[in-house]
């Protein structure tokens, strides 16, 4: 049969509230060299136990009896400390354990989860969480909104999760936990009511450097909207901005709109350029969330200036005209140039030169027409830009280079058809 246990003192019991400090103690009497005392909690050796071992010899000889006392200190009682504690020693080839002592937790409820501050859109449902535990159990919860209980008694209303169907004003929520020992109150969470996200952001009108946009404001509870903020960002060929991406890839152009009306004219834009726009509206409580990015595009405009450095020289029945692209913004894709020339008593001749920047004209009547002047205009899909001032044809001087070009014969009548362009500014000079 087994040897008698060397334990002469067993761990006691500790029951208390969280944070309590206590000590468990066991004592044994052994003959010969004292063993190391280990502590078990629920059968598991405590590897990082805050324990101290004291050994007192009862005689002069090392082989005499020793009293060994081991003390386990529990510094701040937590739920994980609860359980059955025993001392364990290995003596020779035998193992001995003490009688168990118990550590229990009993006190006011302890919150595992408390309601958190958050922002919500007006009239939008949301949930709040609260969780508490004993011991002792059960723990019943009571929710309060703006310090007013939401149920007749603890445990009767919502428990771990409170569903709020929507708020129209900023409110506070807290949670009371009740058990047999008393009541603990959670932190108070402030739920800030922000305006709803604006809806139906759309274009009202488009101009090459200007977009007019409008939107429908969302509900904002009892707080009137103070303003809305519109952001525009170059689309960068669609890179980087997906429908829901929170931040633009570069610094956006930001404009504020007084409300109402829920409309804004965005100016100083580049013509014929894709943008993404979004809008958020603000009340005294803060801003709504942004709408998704809406892709928009400014239309093409007509060139803002005439072609530059026009030179026109005449050599008998031929005239050579050349020019450079307008320095002013084209406001679109340059599709070509129109040229008009006119003599003193002859009708004006209009020509579409295409994208070339020079032309040789074959003049009728062996060049006898006097006071010939030439005008040039650039055009885009949106139409013609301004015409240049009339440039008189100068007589060609020997030594002046004249490149050989395909001759453009003056037609017998000034009537032209424009196969690719159906809208033109008519010109007289």
């Amino acid at each position: 049969q087994a040897e008698e246990s060397p334990f002469v003192g067993n761990p006691g019991n500790i029951t208390g509230a969280r944070g309590l400090t206590g000590t468990l103690r066991c004592q044994l009497q052994v003959q010969g060299e004292p063993p190391e005392v280990h502590w078990l909690r629920d059968g598991q050796i405590l590897e990082l136990a805050d324990s101290t071992q004291t050994q007192v010899p009862l005689g002069e000889d090392e082989q005499d009896d020793w009293i060994v006392v081991s003390q386990l200190r529990i510094t701040s009682l937590q739920l994980s400390d609860t359980g059955q504690y025993q001392c364990l020693v290995f003596l020779g080839h035998q193992t001995f354990v003490s009688q168990p002592g118990y550590v229990g937790l009993e006190g006011l409820p302890y919150f595992l989860e408390e309601p958190e501050d958050r922002t919500v859109a007006a009239n939008t449902p949301f949930n709040l969480s609260c969780q508490a535990q004993g011991p002792p159990e059960p723990v019943d919860l009571l929710w309060l909104q703006d310090a007013v209980p939401l149920a007749t008694a603890p445990g009767h209303g919502p428990q771990r999760s409170l569903h709020v169907p929507g708020l129209n004003k900023t409110s506070s929520f807290s949670c009371e936990a009740h058990n047999a020992k008393g009541v603990t109150t959670s932190r108070t969470a402030t739920i800030t009511v922000l305006p709803q996200q604006p809806r139906n952001l759309h274009l009202v009108s488009r101009q090459p450097t200007e977009l007019e946009v409008a939107w429908t404001p969302g509900l904002s509870g009892i707080y009137p909207l103070t303003h809305c903020t519109l952001q525009a960002v170059l689309s960068d060929d669609g890179m980087g901005i997906q429908a829901g991406e929170p931040d633009p890839p570069e610094e956006p152009l930001t404009s504020q709109a007084s409300v109402p009306p829920h409309q804004l004219r965005l100016g100083s834009l580049h013509p014929h350029t894709p943008y993404h726009i979004r809008v958020a509206c603000t009340s005294s409580q803060g801003p709504s969330s942004w709408t998704h990015w809406l892709p928009v595009e400014t239309p093409e405009g007509v060139p803002l200036g005439p072609p530059e450095n026009i030179s026109a020289t005449r050599n008998g029945s031929q005239a050579f005209v050349h020019w450079q692209e307008p320095r002013a913004p084209l406001q679109g894709t340059l599709l070509g140039y129109r040229l008009a020339y006119q003599g003193q008593d002859t009708p004006e001749v209009l020509m579409d030169i295409g994208l070339r920047q020079e032309v040789t004209l074959e003049l009728q009547g062996d060049g006898s027409v006097s006071n010939l002047t030439v005008c040039v205009a650039a055009y885009t899909a949106a139409g013609d830009g301004p015409w240049s001032l009339p440039v008189p044809l100068e007589a060609w001087r020997p030594g002046q280079a004249q490149p050989v070009h395909q001759l453009v014969k003056e037609p017998s009548t000034p009537a032209f058809s424009w196969p690719h362009h159906h809208h033109h500014h008519h010109h007289h000079h």
Epitope: D42, I45, E47, Q84
Partner: antibody, heavy 116, light 106 residues
């Protein structure tokens, strides 16, 4: 000397329950935890749970919670393991083992075969 | 749960050879335990608290290690040591075992 003697082999049908016993001798039965560990054919060891005979307190591996029940009869120093809703993958050797922070003594094992 | 991985899974060795079995834990633990299981027998405690020999275990067996890496060493292998060896931890619940290392004598 410490001894743990287990009941004999069992053959059960799927859905049935089995109850294995483990009789302890050679030490104060109520002072030490009794654990149950199983070993499927050709496999490793898997801890199922423990019982403290002195109080009847139990702790179970989450995997077996709801299917395993550990009990003791201190008057005859015997521990029991009952496993319910048996499946074919419960076919294994079931061991009881005394623990002192580890498993210092083991029973000889009980083969439970689950087959339809 | 803490996962214990033993290496090697299988080893064939000649008597008198020195054998080392390692056990790696998925998180740091304080103590390791080792068991020997011979065919058709129940496991037997070999090493407790990382380095202490269980009752009746020959001194050729030893254990060492800390943190996540632990070792069982058999200094001069004998024929009777043919068995499967398991490491085990109980630093956190549930207690878990390694997959085992089968030792065969050539």
């Amino acid at each position: 000397q410490v001894q743990l003697v287990q009941s004999g082999a069992e053959v059960k049908k799927p859905g049935a329950s089995v109850k294995v016993s483990c009789k302890a001798s050679g030490y104060p039965f109520t002072d030490f935890y009794i654990n149950w560990v199983r070993q499927a054919p050709g496999q490793g060891l898997e801890w199922m749970g423990w019982i403290y005979p002195g109080s009847g307190n139990t702790k179970y591996n989450e995997k077996f919670k709801g299917r395993v029940t550990l009990t003791v009869d201190t008057s005859i120093s015997t521990a029991y393991m009952e496993l319910s809703r048996l499946r074919s993958d419960d076919t294994a050797v079931y061991y009881c083992a005394r623990s002192t922070g580890f498993f210092d003594y083991w029973g000889q094992g009980t083969l439970v075969t689950v087959s339809s | 749960e803490i996962v214990l991985t033993q290496s090697p899974d299988f080893q064939s060795v000649t008597p008198k050879e020195k054998v080392t079995i390692t056990c790696s834990a998925s998180s740091s633990i304080g103590y390791m335990y080792w068991y020997q299981q011979k065919p058709d027998q129940s496991p037997k405690s070999l090493i407790y608290l990382t380095s202490n020999l269980a009752s009746g275990v020959p001194s050729r067996f030893s254990g060492s290690g800390s943190g996540t890496d632990y070792t069982l060493t058999i200094n001069s292998l004998e024929a009777e040591d043919a068995a499967t060896y398991y490491c085990q931890q109980w630093s956190s619940n549930p207690p878990t075992f390694g997959q085992g290392t089968k030792l065969e004598i050539k």
